[in-house]
Interface confidence: low
């Protein structure tokens, strides 16, 4: 039977009345043009919502906003185009928020041709007021403002200046003139790029890497010859142009680009690209693209100085530079990631790691699925997942894949199964335990959504035609119930939840269409009244992560422990609450070969543990660039993989020598950098 | 051999609904996705939709959404094609043909489409009051 | 959806002469694209797909090239059966389409 229909389904009680009474409607004031929406600060059920109209005129484009405040999580809202005098807002910039709790906004606004600067309007109490400022620049990007002070905002200009403001963008200086990128870092630093010559496009791979770490006061330049750079973690990355050829190599640092050295990467060429895909402090993973326009490349992991790496996957699907990945990182479980890889026969296939890009596998078959046509043999396939390759190719995928870190275990997809992902209507699949298993659960898209830190999840069906009925489970997805919202079917544009899945209201967006008008409107459903009670012990059962075999002493263990979750039995109806915090009990496991990766000059043979030497480098002295002098390396071919926490059992060893040398191949060297102050 | 074996040729009143059958033989039937495809009298061919023979999810053309039902019996390797508030302008030989477009999914450089290499000898069906 | 554009209507040739059929698509189908040919009273049949590769059994005087929006079908020396309509369809998204058909017929 579908999911959700067998008879152990029990039904919450009263549902209907219950969400009834915590349906509020919001019809908005407009013509519908263009809807955006963003949360203001963590837990103040403060959103702004930003409508915006163009009328093309026969000359110019005439364009209206209205702007609109919730300080109940979307139930009731209310005008605020006044306050930011009725100007009309770009939406391209979006609504700039401060980090954390700031209650900080940034709008900014279209002003007229020929005016001297840009506008901006500004608010520091959650929207409730805003002050205007006339910018002495035009601005090309959003204000973005430092993560370590809300009060210092960086942005850049139509003229490529670097522009910074130091008291939330009421006075602004510009620090920096031919800027093409620029950067917040740690501490309040800024790093850009800037080019001599001509332009920004004219000068890449000629460009300046520039750091100041007293918002414009001193400079120093940390890099020459760079095409692009990036942060990610604790590393600085750059891509430098080699002096030979136009070929590039990835550098990196770990103190803020005073020293570099040179990643153990393969070079490319003009045509290719390479791609941080995730990073943390710990380590990186990086997709170095094919030579020639084939859509893919392969995965390289790093070890814990960003400067070693192991190939992790190969044919990795990325379609171009800027283009599209299936790269996911399941926060809902440690060490999982899902990607896409192109097959030799053009086909599209999901893998899966848990270890972090250690290993990769297909997903396994849901219990409750055939395979379709895909699948040379029927009886065994894998679950495909669609991601923002199948979205960006206009298949029928409304939404990515979703994991939240506090809903533990759980992923949602749309996918199908066989021997390839299919071109045909895909169904949605969910994951209780972090990617292992898949069970179907619900036919055909649907738009999905996570609340009360996986209590409630939520669920519209995707369609062409108007709707008025949500789905919504209590028991991670196995059983659904369908609510009707409203009596007259909208035209639905999408679901609203605030960030981080602690809330328990929804909101569901879309537009009513008359005869002669449209207009936006918002249902905010608020599910407290589903879940009655606040969740007790009883209501937790204990759940061991990555457990794959019970028998097994070091079952569960990856990365170099373990860990044990409190969750939510899926037969409780109740609250986590807002304030829940997931529960987990970690424990450190014995070294074995697999927590450690192959060092340079090494790697591991298909479905083999040891590290071999690589047979071009046997009997060579293993040499590499490291801060701009040549090391030499004696190993034994291991290397702790970055972020395992393993003791004890097996510990190969492992010997750095500094050959006092200077690395000829490393265009970053110290003694190539300078200093100067304004 | 490999063939598509369709149902005989159907008149129908407008308003009413036609089902047409197409049995395959000779491959296995689950292996590959079954379109269909009308051609109305002097006009060119029109695809109205395709169906997975394993699970029998199936995608239609926007135009028929609503009035084509695609389904199939795997016990008899058929599949059906029922369309229904019949009009005049639904006049037309009705085909089914193989399609493997669902064996290599979109790739990059493009999914490697196969074409219909089968197809079946037609179903005429007359719109008439 | 994507409209598959083909030209000429008709296409008027003699016997032993060379042939070439063009389609073009609204927007790009990369190489999912096959040819078809229908002669009255008969159902399609499958010349070319993935843009360039013949099916089985297809004689060699047909060819296909072509990626992405424009593509094209050439028949090298016509013969007296090859006189029919011919159909181009793309795969890319769905709906899958087809050409409006070019018919060759004998000058």
């Known amino acids: 039977s579908a999911p959700g229909e067998d008879e152990e389904c029990g039904r919450v009680r009263d549902f209907v009345a219950k969400l009834a009474n915590n349906t509020h409607q919001h019809v908005f004031d407009d013509l519908r043009g263009s809807v955006s929406l963003s949360w203001v600060g963590d837990s103040t059920g403060v959103i702004l919502v930003l409508t915006t109209f163009h009328v093309p005129l026969v000359i110019m484009t005439f364009g209206q906003s209205k702007l609109y405040r919730s300080e109940d999580y979307g139930k009731n809202f209310k005008d605020i185009t006044d306050l930011i005098n009725n100007t009309f807002i770009r939406t391209e910039f979006g609504m700039a928020i401060g980090p954390e709790n700031s209650g900080k906004v940034v709008l900014t606004a279209e002003v007229s041709g020929g005016s001297r600067g840009g506008r901006i309007f500004r608010s520091s109490d959650f929207a409730k007021n805003f002050v205007q400022t006339d910018l002495p620049f035009h601005p090309l990007t959003q204000m973005m403002y430092s993560p370590q002070n809300s009060d210092y905002l960086l942005a850049l200009s139509t003229e490529n200046g670097l522009w910074v403001s130091k008291n939330f963008g009421g006075k602004w200086e510009e620090i920096h003139k031919a800027v093409c990128l620029a950067k917040w870092g740690s501490d309040n630093t800024i790093f850009f790029t800037t080019y001599a010559n001509g332009s920004c496009k004219a000068d890449l791979g000629a460009l300046e890497l520039w750091r100041t770490s007293d918002l414009g006061k001193s400079f120093k330049t940390i890099g020459v010859k760079i095409y692009s750079f990036g942060l990610g973690g604790r590393f600085l990355f750059a891509s430098v142009m080699a002096d030979k050829d136009t070929t590039r190599r990835i550098h990196v640092s770990t103190d803020q680009g005073d020293t570099w050295s040179m990643a153990q990467l393969p070079s490319v060429g003009q045509e290719q690209f390479y791609s941080i895909l995730a990073a943390n402090d710990d380590m990186v993973f990086m997709h170095v693209d094919e030579p020639g326009d084939t859509g893919f490349g392969t995965i390289f992991t790093s070890d814990d100085r960003g400067i070693v790496y192991s190939k992790s996957l190969d044919r990795h699907l990325y379609t171009t530079t800027g283009g599209e990945t299936d790269f996911t990182n399941v926060t809902s479980l440690r060490g999982v990631y899902i990607t896409s890889v192109l097959s030799e026969d053009n086909s599209i296939q999901t893998m899966i790691t848990f270890d972090q890009g250690g290993r990769w596998t297909h997903l396994r078959k849901p219990e409750n699925s055939e395979c379709d046509a895909t699948a040379k043999n029927k009886n065994e396939c894998s679950l495909h997942i669609h991601a923002s390759y199948s979205i960006s190719q206009k298949l029928n995928v409304p939404m990515a894949p979703l994991s939240e870190p506090n809903a533990v275990g759980i992923v949602i997809a749309h996918g199908s199964v066989g021997d390839a992902i299919s071109v045909m209507v895909p169904d949605v699949y969910i994951s209780d335990d972090g990617g292992y298993s898949w069970t179907k659960m619900l036919e055909g898209p649907h738009y999905y959504t996570i609340l009360d830190s996986g209590g409630i999840i939520v669920a519209i069906e995707h369609s062409s035609r108007p709707i008025n009925v949500i789905k919504f489970s209590t028991d991670e997805g196995q059983c659904w119930q369908t609510y009707t919202f409203t009596r007259d079917p909208i035209y639905f544009t999408g679901l609203a939840s605030e960030p981080g899945a602690r809330s328990m209201n929804i909101s569901i967006w879309g537009f009513t269409e008359s005869f002669l008008t449209s207009q936006w409107v918002s249902y905010t459903i608020d599910f407290k009244d589903i879940l009655e009670r606040n969740c007790e012990e009883k209501d937790y059962t204990i759940w061991l992560a990555h457990s794959t075999d019970p028998e097994d002493y070091e079952d569960g263990c990856i990365l170099g422990y373990k860990e044990q979750f409190l969750r939510l039995r899926k037969s409780s109806v109740c609250q986590n609450g807002r304030d829940y915090v997931v529960t987990k009990q970690p424990s450190i496991c014995l070294c074995s070969l697999e927590d450690f990766l192959c060092d340079f000059g090494y790697y591991r043979p298909e479905n083999d543990s040891k590290c071999v030497e690589q047979p071009e480098l046997k009997g060579h002295d293993l040499e590499f660039c490291l801060y701009g002098r040549e090391e030499h390396l004696t190993t034994n071919g291991y290397r702790k993989i970055p972020g395992d926490k393993c003791q004890g059992g097996v510990n190969p060893v492992r010997e750095v020598k500094d050959l006092k040398k200077k690395c000829t191949s490393n265009f970053l060297s110290p003694e190539k950098q300078n200093s100067k102050s304004n | 051999q490999v063939q598509l074996v369709q149902s005989g040729a159907e008149v129908k009143k407008p308003g009413a609904s036609v089902k047409v059958s197409c049995k395959a033989s000779g491959y296995t039937f689950t292996k590959y996705y079954m379109s269909w495809v009308r051609q109305a009298p002097g006009q060119g061919l029109e695809w109205m939709g395709i169906i997975n023979p394993i699970g029998g999810s199936a995608s239609y053309a926007q135009k028929f959404q609503g009035r084509v039902t695609m389904t199939r019996d795997t016990s008899t390797s058929t599949v059906y094609m029922e369309l229904s508030s019949l009009r005049s302008e639904d006049t037309a030989v009705y085909y089914c043909?193989?399609?493997?477009?669902?064996?290599?999914?979109?790739?990059?450089?493009?999914?490697?489409?196969?074409?219909?290499?089968?197809w079946g000898q037609g179903t005429t069906v007359t719109v008439s009051s | 959806e994507i409209v598959m554009t083909q030209s000429p209507a008709t296409l008027s040739v003699s016997p032993g002469e060379r042939a070439t059929l063009s389609c073009r698509a609204s927007?790009?189908?990369?190489?999912?694209l096959a040819w078809y040919q229908q002669k009255p009273g008969q159902a399609p049949r499958l010349l070319i797909y993935?843009?360039?590769t013949r099916a089985t059994g297809i004689p060699a005087r047909f060819s296909g090239s072509g990626s992405g929006t424009e593509f094209t079908l050439t028949i090298s020396s016509l013969q007296s059966e090859d006189f029919a309509v011919y159909y181009c369809?793309?795969?890319?998204?769905?709906?899958?389409?087809f050409g409006g058909g070019t018919k060759v017929e004998i000058k």
């Open positions: 927007q790009s189908v990369s190489s999912n």
């Open positions: 993935g843009a360039s």
């Open positions: 043909a193989r399609d493997p477009s669902g064996i290599a999914a979109a790739g990059p450089a493009g999914r490697y489409y196969y074409g219909m290499d089968v």
């Open positions: 369809q793309q795969a890319r998204l769905g709906p899958w389409t």
